[in-house]
Amino acid sequence: KFSKQSWGLENEALIVRCPRQGKSSYIVDWYYSQTNKSIPTQERNRVFASGQLLKFLPAEVADSGIYTCIVRSPTFNRTGYANVTIYKKQPDCNVPDYLMYSTVSGSEKNSKIYCPTIDLYNWTAPLEWFKNCQALQGSRYKAHKSFLVIDNVMTDDAGDYTCKFIHNENGANYSVTATRSFTVKDEQGFSRFPVIRAPAHNETKEVEIGENTNLTCSACFGKGAQFLATVQWQLNGNKITDFSEPRIQQEEGQNQSFSNGLACVNTVLRIADVKEEDLLLRYDCLALNLHGLRRHTIRLSRKNPIDHQS
């Protein structure tokens, strides 16, 4: 129960905490278990003990093994074991499972990735963050304190995130990296009365006679996958298919997108070679789901010709 697994990479700093806790005033002795040899406390040593912490500055593969810590108080002794493994640096980008810290799960709301074990180190902000070995760039990523915040989390944000920081010990700097997986979970979906994003109700669109124009009907229906969610155009209250005018066509199929996690559906009405009679029609954008139907109306008007008179 009082044994803890710790790992690191060669030539990086590794700091291990004794699995047995005690007040900071308690003395903690560290030993190399195989030989029962005491770990020195002098900081000039590459490996030294500092209270509850055992420091490898830097670590070497040969440091791997089990270390014993004994917390000594006036009334009791508590023994713990630190199982330390130091690995060779990987030549490629791939981070093997045995170097990974616990996976964190994220969602649109849940978007912090903490840098593992950083609390043990004397680090200075900002941290560097990498995803699948690529440095993170862009305003969606905010490195703050010991964590990374991702704005507007999307499914393709899933992956392996590595934090890199510098540990400072008596003026000497040592690099530390730590990697954990980030998975994106679907938030619980829900359905609601449709909300039409476009067009605005009773909107008027200016068009030029003889030109082509597109009208987009866009509505959102809730979050996650929807059982029923459809948008369509009507002309003067009739289905497009019932309106025998080949110049006016509704886009085949409907485009479903997820905007901020919302399930939104778009369909485009394409009008070729706009004619005067098209200005007399009423164009209705209809959004329908199990909660009901919402309708927004848009009309076309002629663009004012440019006045060429002097």
Partner: antibody, heavy 118, light 111 residues
Framework: QSVEESGGRLVTPGTPLTLTCTVS????????MSWVRQAPGKGLEWIGY?????NTYYASWAKGRFTISKTSTTVDLKITSPTTEDTATYFC???????????????WGPGTLVTVSS | AAVLTQTPSPVSAAVGGTVTISCQSS????????LAWYQQKPGQPPKILIY???TLASGVPSRFEGSGSGTQFTLTISDVQCDDAATYYC???????????FGGGTEVVVK
């Protein structure tokens, strides 16, 4: 190093009110700042914070009701449309420098009392 | 939003005795350790005692000890003094963008 709140007063419901937290002895470019409130005889309630890099975050119940902004030496909390439930002492608190978490505030102001009443 | 549930008030303690206050979170705090303990006396702002679940804040006597991880945390005050009479709050930080949450507070009465 200290922080002090000001601007608390009696306001009628719906009248916007801005509280100001003035800091001295440290830089707002190195510390996050939080606003916390406490209704009379009640517990503490976290409202939101503004990070050293100017990003603002709010408790879910506070979104739209409060706005946090800052200058080089002040942090403002705007109560957009106060209701009687917003009657409380409002505290400004400094987040510890270089702490890893977001819950540790080492310097607090004495608080400023806001009373919302018609 | 997360909910932090503290030991119900009031908790009585004798001078020289030990008092334990628990704080349970409905979800894991950030990094499993983003929890702080505060002491508040009437008419005063809160004062930080413990941060990162178990780290003693500067100037705070070692009689105060924080422990726990994930969702379950404890503040232990040993060798209780009259001056420890106050209300104690836990505050958790979470993986959410925001929603830091205070516990409801636990009043400690010293006899």
């Amino acid at each position: 190093q200290s922080v002090e709140e000001s601007g608390g007063r009696l306001v009628t419901p719906g009248t916007p009110l801005t509280l100001t937290c003035t800091v001295s002895g440290f830089s707002l470019s190195s510390h996050d700042m939080s606003w916390v409130r406490q209704a009379p005889g009640k517990g503490l309630e976290w409202i939101g914070y503004i990070w050293s890099d100017d990003n603002t975050y709010y408790a879910s119940w506070a979104k739209g009701r409060f706005t946090i902004s800052k200058t080089s030496t002040t942090v403002d909390l705007k109560i957009t449309s106060p209701t009687t439930e917003d009657t409380a002492t409002y505290f400004c608190a400094r987040d510890q420098y270089r702490s890893s978490g977001v819950s540790d505030y080492d310097i607090w102001g004495p608080g400023t009392l806001v009373t919302v009443s018609s | 939003a997360a909910v932090l549930t503290q030991t119900p008030s009031p908790v009585s303690a004798a001078v020289g005795g030990t008092v334990t206050i628990s704080c349970q979170s409905s979800q894991s705090v950030g990094n499993n350790n983003d929890l702080a303990w505060y002491q508040q006396k009437p008419g005063q702002p809160p004062k930080i005692l413990i941060y990162k679940a178990s780290t003693l804040a500067s100037g705070v006597p070692s009689r105060f000890e924080g422990s726990g991880s994930g969702t379950q945390f404890t503040l232990t005050i040993s060798d209780v003094q009259c001056d420890d009479a106050a209300t104690y709050y836990c505050l958790g930080g979470y993986d959410d963008d925001a929603d830091n949450t205070f516990g409801g507070g636990t009043e400690v009465v010293v006899k």
